[in-house]
């Protein structure tokens, strides 16, 4: 059980208050982490409060500002990059923001020897990615898609790609569905190590179909937005990876890397790609049919200025029980022979965990193992491989950084952050200098956020980065819920969940409950992390009980309950959260009169069929950008779960999952639906057919609408919204305004 | 020594069936990808079916899709091909080779045997 | 699928003379090509990898050269026992299907 210490003592009681709306729409109660940006083994970059880019030197204790607020202000920059050899920064401003991870920007070099601007071979405007070599200060970036290089910041550029074109080809960045469902990234260019090669994916959507929306702005007309997106079946991008030597780029030209025969034999899709050494590069490939991953090891051939990828290079990885990887495929971590690499994939238990393959993945050496998952492998050194997991305890929410000898034998284990803060931090993450000489620990909760600097060698804290004194104090005098996470056995199935309660919580008393749900595959909302929230809102000042409950699908707990909706979605997510109603309900202090569900997106999708699951259970509920029909979502990532939804494959419960399928069950409950207009993620359409559905139906319901508005609602939008919900579950659970 | 032995060959009306073998030894016949290459009377070589070691993946010349079914049993160290639906134009010589473990060239080679579709 | 041409059908020489055959691909094969002997009555043996590379036990008058889309095998001085059909094969990013070119025909004069 984590509880929140209540720090209420009678005494002081009328001095604390509950948490109010504003508190949560204004951040009152935000936290702060500390990442440095490391520069080498001993130093970090860190923007200071008052924006001076200072540089810290661990070792000797020192630091001193490289780039003054005032330079910073000089062409209003909001970020900043160093280049490797320290001569160089560029200044980014202008941010427009694009899709997830994509924004355009404009660039400034500052050259940091004779403190002035770069002239003379200015960078184009706007940006759409920009990143120095690893070492030196050569610069690769892309302008209308097609990628440039620049040997020196002040040289002319030289132009490596050429038929790059708005929506059709993307040179160096991804398209849509690449950004979101495949690399997560704005980029699509990774330099070699030492900066000798550059290698970069070419994305072809010429065939791919166009959703088409308004954006309605303030003009006479809307302006109609179009984004090349493949639904589920559809045409998808056709990928290519190209590298070019930047020494010479004129000399060969850019170099296309073989696809591996089993994979081009049909759909592709490429996954990610790898630097091992200046002249070995490892490619990551999928199956469109995402159940068999191949990664193929490539080497610089020398004599032939190509790039060579043998069938001894490649490594099959497959999935019989569902899709390959978890979220995404993993990537490898290689080691210092440059051709060994640890990997986390599932073991035959059914449990992902790292395993080191040196040649063949059939013949992989297991190197965690357990009933519990490897999570992220962060760093490889000669002796230590650092990872997390949620080993701990047994707590699948929980996040522990963990430390195995590799140099010794037999290896051992030694849990970095188990102990250090123990009531306080339970969910981590870490940053790694150089070959690991330092790190930083970043704990995320139960307790307030806190980040550390480590020693890489004896893991000693040398000092506190952050630790949120402020939030600390402004909480004193909040009454906060009390948070607990516990489990359910049901049917030889675990169901974590957390319920956060009011501040005088009291079991013998009957609560309204909010059921909060994504439930979306590979996710985790049970986790050990502080938040003030709208829901934390909901209970402190509302008097609401709120459970997030992780049922199968989700992630961290082994492949069973993962892979359970494997060309399923919609079934199990829905029952799963219904299972666990009923058991809140034999807890004794849940007034059944009073259940809601609500959720965003995936969350939105599950909301929905559980209001319409007949059951009677839930008075209303909301759903936030809901999908509706998988046949509407992007193809990369529904295909995954549900693959296509052809006869011959899974259209039949393509069309059962539907929520219009069930507009009828709509009628007995309170539904309020929201969506964004200009939604590029989870189309507009989606909520539009649940209104069409329901309206045929002859189904009254509740609407709103945030005309301009993505998949995040965010800005004047997000108070809207949390407003308009609140009402909306005050008056179904009538309490007064 | 490596050595590939094929064995199956025959007389066959169109329409029929048959199943060639090739017996390996003297390699580590699991790691490797295996194929069949075809010789027509007076002809020249036409590649007919591979499987790879690792992972089991088959592949086909579009002659014979669907019609032939390349397999092997590694715990006998032999590979197969099933030939349905036989036409005349299938009559050959039909050799089974070893692929090079790095690319798909044909470092050794059967001796063949002779299918023969005739009515 | 990858074509290849193989030039001249039949190339008629005396032994101790050189012999060139050629090899053209319809599209690059990088340097991903392969040469085969073969003589009647018996299995082809490789000669030839990686465009330029002899195989074990081949003697070194055999020789290959050339990439992308033109690739030659030069014998330096034919041996009686040279005179055969030289096939070439292509296996451009070890993608199905593999091509064989038509053959050359090596015979004495």
């Known amino acids: 059980i984590v509880l929140r210490p209540s720090r209420v003592h009678n005494s002081e009681e009328n001095t604390m208050r509950a948490l109010t709306l504003k508190d949560i729409l204004n951040g009152t109660f935000s936290y702060k982490t500390f990442f440095p940006n490391w520069i080498s083994g001993q130093e970090y970059l860190h923007q200071s409060a008052d924006n001076n880019i200072v540089l810290y030197n661990i070792e000797t204790g020192q630091s001193y500002t490289i780039l003054s607020n005032r330079t910073m202000k000089s062409v209003n920059a909001s970020n900043y990059g160093l280049s490797p050899d320290r001569q160089f920064v560029y200044l980014e401003s202008d941010y427009s923001k694009l899709w997830r991870y994509s924004y355009t920007a404009t660039y400034y070099i500052y050259d940091l020897s004779n403190g002035e601007f770069v002239r003379g071979n200015e960078l184009p405007r706007p940006i759409q990615y920009l990143c120095w070599s690893p070492v030196g200060s050569k610069l690769a970036y892309v302008y209308q898609n097609n990628i440039y290089l620049k040997q020196r910041p002040g040289d002319p550029p030289f132009q490596i790609t050429f038929n790059g074109r708005e929506n059709k080809i993307f040179n160096g960045i991804p398209d849509w569905v690449y950004e979101e469902e495949m690399l997560a990234t704005k980029y699509a260019l990774w330099w070699s190590p030492n900066g000798k090669f550059l290698a970069y994916a070419e994305f072809n959507d010429t065939d791919i179909p166009v959703i088409a929306y308004s954006y309605y702005g303030d003009e006479q007309y809307p302006r109609t937005i179009n984004i090349p997106y493949p639904k589920a079946g559809a045409k998808n991008p056709v990928v290519r990876i190209f590298i070019i030597d930047t020494t010479y780029p004129a000399y060969v030209g850019p170099q296309e890397v073989p696809v591996p025969a089993m994979i081009a034999s049909s759909d592709y899709y490429f996954s990610w790609l790898t630097w091992v050494t200046d002249e070995r590069v490892c490619l990551q490939w999928l199956k469109r049919v995402q159940n068999v991953s191949v990664l193929s090891i490539c080497d610089f051939r020398e004599d032939w200025q190509t790039w060579d990828c043998p069938k001894t290079q490649e490594h099959i990885e497959e999935s019989r029980t569902g899709w390959a990887g978890g979220f995404f495929v993993s990537t490898p971590v290689f080691s210092y022979d440059a051709i060994s690499y640890y990997k986390i994939f599932s073991d035959k238990d059914g449990y992902k965990h790292i395993h080191y393959i040196k040649d063949t993945v059939e013949n992989a050496i297991q190197i965690t193992s357990g009933k519990w998952e490897a999570i992220n492998i962060f760093r490889v050194t000669q002796d230590s491989l650092f990872y997390s997991s949620n080993e701990f305890e047994e707590y699948p929410g929980r996040r522990n950084i963990y430390r195995i000898s590799i140099g010794s034998y037999p290896p051992s284990k030694k849990c970095v952050t188990c102990h250090l803060r123990k009531e306080r931090c339970q969910y981590y993450t870490a940053s790694f200098s150089d070959y690991a000489k330092y790190y930083a620990l970043v704990c995320y909760g139960p307790g307030i956020p806190i980040s550390t600097l480590h020693d890489g060698r004896t893991d000693q804290e040398i000092k506190i980065l952050e630790e949120n004194k402020e939030l600390e104090n402004a909480l004193k005098n909040i009454q906060l819920p009390k948070e607990e996470i516990k489990k359910l056995e049901v049917d030889e199935i675990t169901l974590w969940y957390k319920m956060i309660l009011p501040p005088q919580f009291d079991r013998s008393k009957k609560y309204p409950l909010l059921i909060q749900v994504y439930g979306g595959p590979c996710s985790q909302s049970v986790r050990s992390v502080f938040a003030v929230n709208w829901i934390s809102y909901l209970a402190s000042k509302e008097g609401m009980v709120i459970a997030l409950v992780d049922g199968r699908g989700t992630a961290f707990q082994g492949d069973k309950l993962l892979y359970a909706v494997y060309r399923k979605l919609g079934v199990y997510e829905v029952e799963d959260q219904i299972t666990a109603v009923r058991k809140f309900i034999e807890m004794g202090f849940i007034d059944e009169k009073r259940i809601a569900i609500w959720g965003w997106s995936y969350g939105g999708y599950v909301s929905s069929l559980a209001l319409a699951s007949g059951t009677g259970l839930f008075k209303c509920g909301i759903a936030v950008a809901p999908v509706s029909s998988w046949e509407y979502y992007a193809s990369v990532y529904t295909e995954r779960f549900m693959g296509l939804p052809t006869k011959d494959d899974n259209l039949e419960h393509y069309k059962n999952s539907t929520v219009m399928a069930r507009a009828e069950y709509f009628r007995n409950v309170d539904y309020l639906l929201i969506h964004g207009t200009a939604d590029d993620n989870v189309h507009f359409q989606n909520s539009a057919q649940i209104a069409k559905a329901l309206v045929n139906a002859q189904v009254d319901f509740q609407a709103m609408w945030y005309s301009d508005q993505n998949h995040g609602l965010s800005g004047l939008s997000t108070n809207h919204l949390y407003t308009h919900m609140t009402h909306f579950l005050k008056q179904c659970f009538s309490l007064s305004d | 020594d490596v050595q590939l032995v094929e064995s199956g060959g025959g007389v066959v009306r169109p329409g029929e069936s048959l199943t060639l073998s090739c017996a390996a030894s003297?390699?580590?016949?699991?790691?490797?990808?295996m194929g069949w290459v075809r010789q027509a009377p007076g002809e020249g070589l036409e590649w007919v079916s591979g499987i790879r070691g690792r992972g089991g993946s088959t592949y086909y010349a579009e002659s014979v899709k669907g019609r032939f079914t390349i397999s092997r049993e590694s715990s006998k160290n032999t590979l197969y091909l099933q030939m349905n639906s036989l036409r005349a134009e299938d009559t050959a010589v039909y050799y089974c080779a070893k692929e090079n473990e790095r690319h798909s060239f044909f470092e050794y080679w059967g001796l063949g045997t002779l299918v023969t579709v005739s009515s | 699928e990858i074509v290849l041409t193989q030039s001249p059908g039949t190339l008629s020489l005396s032994p101790g003379e050189r012999a060139t055959l050629s090899c053209r691909a319809s599209q690059s094969v990088g340097h991903y090509l392969a040469w085969y002997q073969q003589k009647p009555g018996q299995a082809p043996r490789l000669l030839i990898y990686?465009?330029?590379n002899r195989a074990i036990d081949i003697p070194d008058r055999f020789s290959g050269s050339g990439s992308g889309t033109e690739f030659t095998l030069t014998i330096s001085r034919l041996e009686p026992e040279d005179f055969a059909v030289y096939y070439c094969?292509?296996?451009?990013?070890?993608?199905?299907?593999?091509?064989f070119g038509g053959g050359t025909k090596v015979e004495i004069k």
């Open positions: 990686d465009a330029s």
């Open positions: 003297g390699f580590t016949f699991s790691s490797y990808d």
């Open positions: 094969q292509q296996y451009y990013n070890d993608w199905p299907p593999l091509t």
